[in-house]
């Protein structure tokens, strides 16, 4: 089952996600999506990084920490009830089926 996180309407939601880069600055792509992690990639992508930097993000969705050190936690600004649901953090480690997938449940009150 998903780990549950809570936030209040109008506040910021924080969804933690971490990995350990193989070497400093040796990043792997990460995607965040709304909905449970599918077999590949992320569905309904809200933010994505590549091997170097953030390369896609949408309004209100931000990386919250020092992603170059493996902190790829997500901040959702000014949440509404519509933001409730499952979010997928996917660490896209090279190789077949090597990805680390984390499903996080956001509950808005």
């Amino acid at each position: 089952s998903e780990v549950e996180y809570r936030a209040e309407v109008g506040q910021n939601a924080y969804l933690p996600c971490f990995y350990t880069p193989a070497a400093p600055g040796n990043l792997v792509p990460v995607c965040w999506g709304k909905g449970a992690c599918p077999v590949f990639e992320c569905g309904n992508v809200v933010l994505r990084t590549d091997e170097r930097d953030v390369n896609y993000w949408t309004s209100r969705y931000w990386l919250n920490g020092d992603f170059r050190k493996g902190d790829v936690s997500l901040t959702i600004e000014n949440v509404t009830l519509a933001d409730s649901g499952i979010y997928c953090c996917r660490i896209q480690i090279p190789g077949i089926m090597n990805d680390e997938k984390f499903n996080l449940k956001l509950v808005i009150k």
Partner: antibody
């Protein structure tokens, strides 16, 4: 081309107030965290305050907390710093700086304005 | 709160290599950014995320970060590199952006 242009500096007496502005152009203003950084004459850089892209979160150095207020008007592409209860030690060049992209905090300062001088003296 | 310690000054002959250190408790666990500031001018970002170089910054500039020390290295130093250099980190514990005290790089001759 990214441009940041500060204004509003000048001479003010201790205890007085001043409002700095930073007009931004060349990028989608609301997508970036912004900061104010100052430099006293002959001294190093000191971060003063930061604000998230939407303006929903603000952060302050301990030295200015309760006296300075950062804000932004995304419809005008403008960043502000309201400075109250000014002290002699607030004398500095104040720079407006744009944070890095895709990060809530704007981890580093990618672009800087030329600065505006604030002098607090009687 | 993290304190960033830089040497006040570094001198180097033209064509040689200059190294400017930035010390801090476990600074290797944070991303370090470096700025160059020439007299009467605004700072310019020269290194970000420990070792990345913005476009327009010569390859002579490089950075590293490990343990308790981050280092800015300038190879084949030129007279135009004479400036003040500042390291910077984002301290997420305090939500403060921190600068080192700055290092004045003097190019001899």
């Amino acid at each position: 081309e990214v441009q940041l242009l500060e204004s509003g500096g000048g001479l003010v007496q201790p205890g007085g107030s001043l409002r700095l502005s930073c007009a931004a152009s060349g990028f989608t203003f609301s997508s970036y965290a912004m900061s104010w950084v100052r430099q006293a004459p002959g001294k190093g850089l000191e971060w003063v305050s930061a604000i998230s892209g939407s303006g929903g979160s603000t952060y302050y150095a301990d030295s200015v907390k309760g006296r300075f207020t950062i804000s932004r008007d995304n419809s005008k592409n403008t960043l502000y710093l309201q400075m109250n209860s000014l002290r002699a030690e607030d004398t500095a060049v104040y720079y407006c700086a744009r944070g890095s992209y895709g990060t809530y905090y704007g981890n580093y300062f990618e672009y800087w304005g030329r600065g505006t001088l604030v002098t607090v003296s009687s | 709160q993290t304190v960033l310690t830089q040497p006040p000054s570094v001198s180097v002959a033209p064509g040689k290599t200059a190294s400017i250190s930035c010390g801090g408790d476990n600074i290797g666990g944070k991303s370090v950014h470096w700025y160059q500031q020439k007299p009467g001018q605004a700072p310019v970002l020269v290194i970000y995320y420990d070792s990345d170089r913005p476009s327009g910054i010569p390859q002579r500039f490089s950075g590293s970060n490990s343990g308790n020390t981050a280092t800015l290295t300038i190879h084949r130093v030129e007279a135009g590199d004479e400036a003040d250099y500042y390291c910077q980190v984002l301290d997420r514990r305090s939500d403060h952006w921190l600068f080192g005290g700055g290092t004045k790089l003097t190019v001899l001759g």
